[in-house]
């Protein structure tokens, strides 16, 4: 089972690993040459710090936290990454016209530290 600890952020509200949404155009994403729609995407991503045991994804993340405290120069702190994703469908350009294509790893659904 995943050893995920509490959501209380010791650094203050909004400072720890969390889901963040950024509105981006196809041009911002570099997709304008192959995607037709949607023209704007609400990109959900994971940002924030991973202090001791905060949203630890597993025991490895807990170990990493402990070792980072002891050897911060050689062991990095856990990183805030997606725990799961929301699927998304895009209307794409093709050689013959347009098509629908689904992607299951574009948008973060929730976040954890690993």
């Amino acid at each position: 089972a995943r050893a995920r600890n509490g959501d209380h952020c010791p650094l203050g509200p909004g400072r720890c690993c969390r889901l963040h949404t950024v509105r981006a155009s196809l041009e911002d994403l570099g997709w304008a040459d192959w995607v037709l729609s949607p023209r704007e995407v609400q990109v959900t991503m994971c940002i924030g710090a991973c202090p001791s045991q905060f949203r630890a994804a597993n025991r490895h993340a807990q170990i990493k936290t402990s070792l980072h405290r002891l050897k911060p120069d050689t062991v990095p702190a856990p990183c805030c990454v997606p725990a799961s994703y929301n699927p998304m469908v895009l209307i794409q350009k093709t050689d013959t016209g347009v098509s629908l294509q689904t992607y299951d790893d574009l948008l973060a659904k929730d976040c954890h530290c690993i």
Epitope: L36, R39, V98, T102, D104
Partner: antibody
Framework: EVQLVQSGAEVKKPGESLKISCKGS????????IGWVRQMPGKGLEWMGV????????IYSPSFQGQVTISADKSISTAYLQWSSLKASDTAMYYC????????????WGQGTLVTVSS | QSVLTQPPSVSGAPGQRVTISCSGS????????VNWYQQLPGTAPKLLIY???NRPSGVPDRFSGSKSGTSASLAITGLQAEDEADYYC??????????FGGGTKLTVLG
């Protein structure tokens, strides 16, 4: 409040043409795709196709490609489904539905338009 | 023949728990999400569950969805008379785009 209001029931003869409508309100019409779904009498749901009202890009189910035309007029927040030559087998309830933000599900549905084709 | 397979009918008494299955393949449910819709008699379908296990606001927590491998299921606990309806699963298929199950008629006994 998000609403999709469809045009009224139609009774047509085989070979006639028809265009039914779906007017969106309560949201930015060009920000969400619109899909059309068929339900034949006593049967299940069948996806027909999708339109992006902003760029008018359309994609059809292979089963409906060439059988119907989907279009939209973003100036009046309305999507359309049309036939150039109806058949008796087109008798069904037709629903328009708005896609959710990620284009993977239908979050709001119109009330349906019943199309009856009979000689 | 639907790409997604559902039982034609299920039934249960008020207060009971019922489940509706939706079986697919590695080209649809196996790789992506499942959504569920409720269609009450004489009305349009309504979104019940999206992305496998998420409920839109306003849908009671008596309804829940899950997915495992190439199958998904909808569970309804504390069955009520007003739950009598047709239920459809829907997913994405690499060849047909958006696909629906054939639908399941839920009868509330008594």
């Amino acid at each position: 409040e998000v609403q999709l209001v469809q045009s009224g029931a139609e009774v047509k003869k085989p070979g006639e043409s028809l265009k039914i409508s779906c007017k969106g309100s309560g949201y930015s019409f060009t920000s969400y795709w619109i899909g059309w779904v068929r339900q034949m009498p006593g049967k299940g749901l069948e996806w027909m196709g999708v339109i992006d009202p902003d760029g008018s890009y359309t994609i059809y189910s292979p089963s409906f490609q060439g059988q119907v035309t989907i279009s939209a007029d973003k100036s009046i927040s309305t999507a359309y489904l049309q036939w150039s030559s109806l058949k008796a087998s087109d008798t069904a309830m037709y629903y328009c539905a708005r896609y959710g933000r990620y284009g993977t599900y239908f979050d709001y549905w119109g009330q349906g338009t019943l199309v009856t084709v009979s000689s | 023949q639907s790409v997604l397979t559902q039982p034609p009918s299920v039934s249960g008494a008020p207060g009971q728990r019922v489940t509706i299955s939706c079986s697919g393949s590695s080209s649809n449910i196996g790789v992506l999400y499942v959504n569920w819709y409720q269609q009450l008699p004489g009305t349009a379908p309504k979104l019940l569950i999206y992305s496998n296990d998420n409920r839109p606001s306003g849908v009671p927590d008596r309804f829940s969805g899950s997915k495992s491998g190439t199958s998904a299921s909808l569970a309804i606990t504390g069955l009520q008379a007003e739950d009598e309806a047709d239920y459809y699963c829907q997913s994405w298929d690499s060849s047909s785009n958006y696909v629906f199950g054939g639908g399941t008629k839920l009868t509330v006994l008594g």
